[in-house]
Amino acid sequence: LQDLCSNCPAGTFCDNNRSQICSPCPPNSFSSAGGQRTCDICRQCKGVFKTRKECSSTSNAECDCISGYHCLGAECSMCEQDCKQGQELTKKGCKDCCFGTFNDQKRGICRPWTNCSLDGKSVLVNGTKERDVVCGPSPADLSPGASSATPPAPAREPGHHHHHHHDYKDDDDKGDYKDDDDKIDYKDDDDK
């Protein structure tokens, strides 16, 4: 006997109460694939969330975060508080970066300044809480009598030398926090 349910398209469900007739998904629900025996409940974007895309009969709603918060987790499952540049988020709120570290974004952790000397270069521009140091030519290149025929190598992009850097372009990170006691720890809960 052929399974009639496989003929039910997205946006419907196979209704066993009605001899496997394909019934439309009820309001506030959707089915994104064919052959479904139930429709899934639409996500609602309320409170700290705002709607990026309304739920339809074939696709779930998509949420963003309201101003002052940014998405974390797959499909913006959580909204995390923004901090200012030069700060990082801890369990006690936004805290200024310690000396020798910086954060040039509203999210993520403070990271160590680039160590120019490890690459044989000198500090051209000092680092701040908001900006990495800028490395320039090595001290030898700047000494009197040094050949100036060859232009100095361009400084590496801030933050990319000798320590990890994350651009935060994706929403699928779970929070990029250090393991310090006061850093936020995102545990996967039991029944989400």
Partner: antibody
Framework: QVQLQESGPGLVKPSETLSLTCTVS????????WSWIRQPPGKGLEWIGY???????NYNPSLKSRVTISVDTSKNQFSLKLSSVTAADTAVYYC????????????WGQGTTVTVSS | QSVLTQPPSASGTPGQRVTISCSGS????????VNWYQQFPGTAPKLLIY???QRPSGVPDRFSGSKSGTSASLAISGLQSEDEADYYC???????????FGGGTKLTVLG
């Protein structure tokens, strides 16, 4: 499984501030709304306010001027402060976990009775 | 006064089917899903139905929920004496940006 436990004084004098704490055990505070609900003797449920784990708050307009809810993720706790209390604030106070995508309260504390009396 | 309107009481005999109504407006039930809570005397409320008609694990299928427009209802079929309790409807209200409750319905099982 997640459990909630309210704690705080059971007796508060009029005009003082009611302070309650809800401790979350068996799970993370991250990713949820956390609400305070109260129920005066013989009456229905009233939403006081909620806090999202990352600090976003919203309060019932009828209580907004007197309410503060805060969260301490390091202790897995959130707290309620209700100022300038009167006898009308006598109630059982519940803390709840609210699902952040579908907005139902799936975990409730056992409740704590607060009496406002001199 | 509660934002959502429920009858203060309802009753039925064992085995009967009983429904409890919940009326709201376009800013709550009309645009959001409805949840139902069951509360026995001296205990905390318990989630009974969420997202209009979904039952949490452990809730008997005698309990069902539905929603139409700005109203919702809870149906209890095959009524049992242990169903005697208070029932509250609730839902998100867009104008409040928070949840609202009905005043509660006291269900009495007769006989």
């Amino acid at each position: 499984q997640v459990q909630l436990q309210e704690s705080g004084p059971g007796l508060v004098k009029p005009s003082e501030t009611l302070s309650l704490t809800c401790t979350v055990s068996g799970g993370s505070i991250s990713g949820y709304y956390w609400s305070w609900i109260r129920q005066p003797p013989g009456k229905g449920l009233e939403w006081i306010g909620y806090i999202y784990y990352s600090g976003f708050t919203n309060y019932n307009p009828s209580l907004k001027s007197r309410v503060t809810i805060s969260v301490d993720t390091s202790k897995n706790q959130f707290s309620l402060k209700l100022s300038s209390v009167t006898a009308a604030d006598t109630a059982v106070y519940y803390c709840t976990r609210d699902h952040s995508h579908y907005y139902y309260m799936d975990v409730w504390g056992q409740g704590t009775t607060v009496t406002v009396s001199s | 006064q509660s934002v959502l309107t429920q009858p203060p009481s309802a009753s039925g005999t064992p085995g009967q089917r009983v429904t409890i109504s919940c009326s709201g407006s376009s800013s709550n039930i009309g645009s959001n899903t409805v949840n139902w809570y069951q509360q026995f005397p001296g205990t905390a409320p318990k989630l009974l139905i969420y997202s209009n008609n979904q039952r949490p694990s452990g809730v008997p299928d005698r309990f069902s929920g539905s929603k139409s427009g700005t109203s919702a209802s809870l149906a209890i079929s095959g009524l049992q004496s242990e169903d005697e309790a208070d029932y509250y409807c609730a839902g998100w209200d867009d104008s409040l940006n928070g949840p609202v409750f009905g005043g509660g319905t006291k269900l009495t099982v007769l006989g």
